[in-house]
């Protein structure tokens, strides 16, 4: 049994880091493998992660982490029984993938303005709480070409757009994702999408 693709990990910079790797053949990850991890720090304790399958030869492990700070560095040991398959390390602050925003809501009752709001996925005492920016994706279910991205570079988790910038009488979907420049993060996953029917009063044409 060998590791084909070494583990790569990303952290949500709050409580979970996710490591993925590939074996050289079909593997029952949860019964055959264990990923041991330990913070390189005074008084820290070793923890064991039981991986799950992620495709035939792929494995994924969700590592629980507390009180994440920039200095944190973890040792990682991948074991198959008594055999050490791989040894490495992981610094969460250097591989951050933010949590996805949640509770995306489209408010359509504001005089021909669409107000999209969502929730910041971090608590106020987490550093990322005040450092997320967002991308909102809106697309038409009827027309694949009607696909747009709005960049939200201010801190407030909301976006206002004129309903008239979208076509009237058809259904749209929206989703939102986040990233943080301060840690040079990757983008989060997209939030679940939400659907609404876009309608607005056409202005009277002047002749």
């Amino acid at each position: 049994m060998k590791v084909l693709q070494e583990p790569t990990c990303v952290s949500d910079y709050m409580s979970i880091s996710t490591c993925e790797w590939k074996m050289n053949g079909p593997t029952n990850c949860s019964t055959e493998l264990r990923l041991l991890y330990q913070l390189v720090f005074l008084l820290s304790e070793a923890h064991t992660c039981i991986p799950e399958n992620n495709g035939g030869a792929g494995c994924v492990c969700h590592l629980l982490m507390d009180d994440v700070v920039s200095a944190d560095n973890y040792t990682l040991d991948l074991w198959a029984g008594q055999q050490l398959l791989w040894k490495g390390s992981f610094k969460p602050s250097e591989h951050v993938k933010p949590r996805a925003p949640g509770n995306l809501t489209v408010h359509t009752n504001v005089s021909d303005t669409l107000l999209l709001t969502w929730s910041n996925p971090y608590p106020p005492d987490n550093y990322l709480y005040n450092h997320l920016t967002y991308a909102v994706n809106i697309w038409s279910e009827n027309d694949p070409a009607d696909f747009r991205i709005y960049n939200v570079t201010y801190l407030e988790p909301s976006l206002r757009i004129a309903a008239s910038t979208l076509k009237s009488g058809i259904s749209y979907r929206a989703r939102v994702r986040a990233w943080a420049q301060c840690y040079n993060t990757t983008w989060s996953e997209w939030s679940p999408s939400t659907k609404w029917h876009n309608s607005y009063r056409e202005p009277f044409e002047q002749h």
Epitope: L42, L43, S44, D67
Partner: antibody, heavy 116, light 111 residues
Framework: QVQLVQSGAEVKKPGASVKVSCKAS????????MHWARQAPGQGLEWMGI????????SYAQKFQGRVTMTRDTSTSTVYMELSSLRSEDTAVYYC?????????WGKGTLVTVSS | QSVLTQPPSVSAAPGQKVTISCSGG????????VSWYQQLPGTAPKLLIY???KRPSGIPDRFSGSKSGTSATLAITGLQTGDEADYYC????????????FGTGTKLTVL
């Protein structure tokens, strides 16, 4: 919200011991290390040691080795700092603070006075 | 005696900028991240800056931190009378880190 509530002021005689408590609430108690620091009247902050509430392991500043004991009770989310063989120079305000970087808020402090 | 040295006192007028230095060595500041703590008169210390330059929520952006080599600096702009306090730097000490150490402390007076 996060709170660290410390026990009340103590007056002790030289040679005695004192045990100060710090009750935590508003967060997962075993997820954050707990520090103890002290401040003598008119002096600066002095780090005493740290405890990992998850397993109870401890590390103490060399100055306090053999005189300080830090323990925790996970059932009440409380950490304790006991200092023995007290002398007059141990008169200070003793603080608890959580997390690797002594996050906010700290405990309000416990004044320990050592006087004959 | 702390291994992190700070000036005993600094002063400036309201609205001005003030900086407080924290000088250490390769086994502490040079090999770790620096935090800064503010202690208002009669109160417990409060974390002001961590990881050299990050502010916890609720700390105004008038406070900033930086680190270069074996020394760190806390800067306060737009000084207010309410900023009058003692300021301490702090960092993990040793390789690997085994002790936390506070600086000697600096008394800030707003004139």
């Amino acid at each position: 919200q996060v709170q660290l509530v410390q026990s009340g002021a103590e007056v002790k005689k030289p040679g005695a011991s004192v045990k100060v408590s710090c009750k935590a609430s508003g967060y997962a108690f075993t997820s954050y290390y707990m520090h103890w620091a002290r401040q003598a009247p008119g002096q600066g902050l002095e780090w005493m040691g740290i405890i990992n509430p998850s397993g109870g392991s401890t590390s103490y500043a060399q100055k306090f080795q053999g005189r300080v004991t830090m323990t925790r009770d996970t059932s009440t989310s409380t950490v304790y700092m006991e200092l023995s063989s007290l002398r007059s120079e141990d008169t200070a305000v003793y603080y608890c603070a959580r997390g690797k970087l002594l996050k906010n808020p700290w405990g309000k402090g416990t004044l320990v006075t050592v006087s004959s | 005696q702390s291994v992190l040295t700070q000036p005993p006192s600094v002063s400036a007028a309201p609205g001005q900028k003030v900086t407080i230095s924290c000088s250490g060595g390769s086994s502490n500041i040079g090999n770790s991240y620096v935090s800064w703590y503010q202690q208002l008169p009669g109160t417990a210390p409060k974390l002001l800056i961590y990881d050299n330059n990050k502010r916890p929520s609720g700390i105004p952006d008038r406070f900033s931190g930086s680190k270069s080599g074996t020394s760190a600096t806390l800067a306060i702009t737009g000084l207010q009378t309410g900023d009058e306090a003692d300021y301490y730097c702090g960092t993990w000490f040793g390789t690997p880190a085994s002790n936390y150490v506070f600086g000697t402390g600096t008394k800030l007076t707003v004139l």
